[in-house]
């Protein structure tokens, strides 16, 4: 009696179970009563990453330098190429189909997490006692200068965008 279901890594065709093609190979012909499934390797720039019955392999992803992309990991017959972004840029999506320039943190904000090829810069507001006076994709919030340790006094209070201004202590005249 012809099967109605097949084992893992098999498929049902013409009332018989045929082996699927292994990753890295495409289907040429279904199995027959005389021969097993005919599969052939994917070509130079192609891949198939699962046990399959695909009659064509997929093309490797192209990392287009015009979109700021470069190859992070070269594809094989069983894996797709992985793209990432050039220095200073990050992917716009998980699929990494294009790149945008890393965001800079404005004055009053510091870098909490530096951007990577796949994630943008994360900024945080400088808390009391810290400041950032530049727009930067790398600079963290800096602590205000401690006037006391320099034997100076605060002449102008700091903000989240400016450091304190220190000055000499006023000496009391005798």
């Amino acid at each position: 009696e012809p099967p109605t279901a097949c084992r893992e890594k098999q498929y049902l065709i013409n009332s018989q179970c045929c082996s699927l093609c292994q990753p890295g190979q495409k289907l040429v012909s279904d199995c027959t009563e005389f021969t097993e499934t005919e599969c052939l390797p994917c070509g130079e720039s192609e891949f198939l990453d699962t046990w399959n019955r695909e009659t064509h392999c997929h093309q490797h992803k192209y990392c287009d330098p015009n979109l700021g992309l470069r190859v992070q990991q070269k594809g094989t017959s069983e894996t797709d190429t992985i793209c990432t972004c050039e220095e200073g840029w990050h992917c716009t999506s998980e699929a990494c189909e294009s790149c945008v320039l890393h965001r800079s943190c404005s004055p009053g904000f510091g870098v909490k997490q530096i951007a990577t090829g796949v994630s943008d810069t994360i900024c945080e507001p400088c808390p009391v006692g810290f400041f950032s006076n530049v727009s930067s994709a790398f600079e963290k919030c800096h602590p205000w200068t401690s006037c006391e340790t320099k034997d100076l006094v605060v002449q102008q209070a700091g903000t989240n965008k400016t450091d304190v201004v220190c000055g000499p202590q006023d000496r009391l005249r005798a």
Partner: antibody, heavy 116, light 111 residues
């Protein structure tokens, strides 16, 4: 049982076009096998791969014949065809059609003579 | 791509074993496990005897076996019989949906 049958003129003049058709019976050209091929054999010589076609039309040709060969498919007639341009006496051969790249089913072959 | 190299002839007496070689390169025989062997009797179409180096289609006697080492594939016919007298051709996948055949070997059964 799958059967393949080549057909076409047995005599072609030099510089003309050799045209052959392979008719598949006992199965569909677009299922069971998805790729189909042509092979030839000059009298008293060995087998030579000419090319293959995917049932949706993609073609793969022998580098040595690529500039002169065209393989096409007609799924409605369950046929695929071979055209070879600018033939010479060296193209005189028995031409076979076959299934897949493994060639587990063959036509019986047809002799094409190139002569004026 | 060049044709695979086969000896033009081979022979053996009934009951003996004979081995036919098929030598290619790392781009064909050595690069893929896609070697096939065909038997062709005079005036007939070739018949698939071995595929994927060593697999036999059902119906082909187990006297026929295939193997591969490096860039050379081999077909062994053991327990030779008169009906084994024929031409034998190897073929190999050569990448990028290309195939290449060997030049053929005429097998003679003596006696």
């Amino acid at each position: 049982q799958l059967q393949l049958q080549e057909s076409g003129p047995g005599l072609v003049k030099p510089s003309e076009i050799l045209s052959l058709t392979c008719t598949v019976s006992g199965g569909s050209i677009s299922s069971s096998s998805y790729y189909w091929g042509w092979i030839r054999q000059p009298p008293g010589k060995g087998l030579e791969w000419i090319g293959n076609i995917y049932y949706r039309g993609d073609t793969y040709y022998s580098p040595s014949l690529k500039s002169r060969v065209t393989i096409s498919v007609d799924t409605s007639k369950n046929q695929f065809s071979l055209k070879l341009n600018s033939v010479t006496a060296a193209d005189t051969a028995v031409y076979y059609c076959a299934k897949g790249f493994r060639f587990d089913y063959w036509g019986q072959g047809t002799l094409v003579t190139v002569s004026s | 791509q060049s044709a695979l190299t086969q000896p033009p002839s081979a022979s053996g007496s009934p009951g003996q074993s004979v081995t036919i070689s098929c030598t290619g390169t790392s781009s064909d025989v050595g690069g893929y496990n896609y070697v096939s062997w065909y038997q062709q009797h005079p005036g007939k179409a070739p018949k698939l005897m071995i595929y994927e180096v060593s697999k036999r289609p059902s119906g082909v006697p187990d006297r026929f076996s295939g193997s591969k080492s490096g860039n050379t594939a081999s077909l062994t016919v053991s327990g030779l019989q008169a009906e084994d007298e024929a031409d034998y051709y190897c073929s190999s996948y050569a990448g990028s949906n290309n195939l290449v055949f060997g030049g053929g070997t005429k097998l003679t059964v003596l006696g």
